[in-house]
């Protein structure tokens, strides 16, 4: 699996999307888990409604919400009030029995709240971008780009 990078600003909300084949994963509940250590287990953060037909209902665990568009094939995770320690490697999973298929590996990067308190709209965001295959990516603690500072484009 490639790793997809999502960036957000500390204190704000971040939405992560995980597309999937709706037919292949028909009837399956979904989950969002956090990788602990490079080779450690993926610890469940939140999962969709126990009744698959109600997967569209948003479920919260603390500041993390999950909702599933089972027809469109998009799992959406919302991280509210993003914090530096939320940065890290996560997975979107499709559950079947005691097994879990990885839908997408996600790296959440947290940008520090801009020092000059500009709107997040003034920041440079790549949105989401694919990283290299089989990537294990460090969680990203970062600041906004300073005036006149030009980032290089994301690699893909």
């Amino acid at each position: 699996h490639n790793t997809t990078v999502f960036q957000g600003v500390a204190g704000q909300s971040l939405q992560v999307s995980c597309p999937y084949d709706s037919m292949k994963h028909w009837g399956r509940r979904k989950a969002w888990c956090r990788q602990l250590g490079e080779k450690g287990p993926c610890q469940r953060v939140v999962s969709t409604h126990n009744l698959w037909l109600l997967s569209f209902l948003r479920r919260w665990n603390g500041s993390t919400a999950i909702t599933d568009d089972t027809l469109g094939g998009t799992l959406t995770i919302t991280l509210r009030n993003l914090q530096p320690h939320d940065a890290g490697l996560y997975q979107c999973q499709s559950l079947h029995g005691s097994e879990a298929d990885t839908l997408r590996k996600v790296l959440v990067e947290v940008l520090a709240d801009p020092l000059d308190h500009r709107d997040a709209g003034d920041l440079w965001f790549p949105g989401e971008s694919e990283s290299f295959e089989d990537a294990h990516v460090e969680h990203s603690i970062s600041r906004s780009l300073l005036e006149g500072e030009i980032p290089f484009p994301p690699t893909s």
């Epitope: 890290g88 940008l111 990516v137 969680h139 990203s140 980032p151």
Partner: antibody, heavy 120, light 107 residues
Amino acid sequence: QVQLVQSGAEVKKPGASVKVSCKASGYTFTSYGISWVRQAPGQGLEWMGWISTYNGNTNYAQKLQGRVTMTTDTSTSTAYMELRSLRSDDTAVYYCARGSGSGYDSWYDWGQGTLVTVSS
Amino acid sequence: DIQMTQSPSSLSASVGDRVTITCRASQSISSYLNWYQQKPGKAPKLLIYAASSLQSGVPSRFSGSGSGTDFTLTISSLQPEDFATYYCQQSYDFPITFGGGTKVEIK
């Protein structure tokens, strides 16, 4: 295996700048961020900042803001740390480190360190 | 900034001793705490991450515990190669901060 090889020792005069390099090998460079940590002689560890090798975003320690710049060259899998307006208290061993990918900012691969001496 | 206070700053112990080092954060950092070992002239080495998870390849005599503000690194039976300086480090919030270090010396 993973290796982070840093540039050699430097002696600089106060007010000058220094640029330390950290060449990575043994893994996909753009898949792990690089942090910089320094250690003054006989002192503890001080986090200087971090750079995302994915897109160049950085986070710097407040006390170094304006004096430090971290960059990467993905074509050579090399990270750089430049420190300007050097003072005698910048004399330290500077380390680069690769992150764990765990969401807990722990570093298990480190460069060998680069001694920067600031002296008139 | 979150202040990390380590104690003791140094200690003398013998091979085979049980050694305990404590680290206190100035505010709750949940389990976002790591422990490093550093020997003179060498780069630090990760021992424990996420307060209690043993890094791969690190001997099982090292263990970590704690959550919130109080954390402990324990060496169950000190070995000759364990004489070094140990640092705790928080990654809960910007900026990342370290404890002042604990030097473990031979008695």
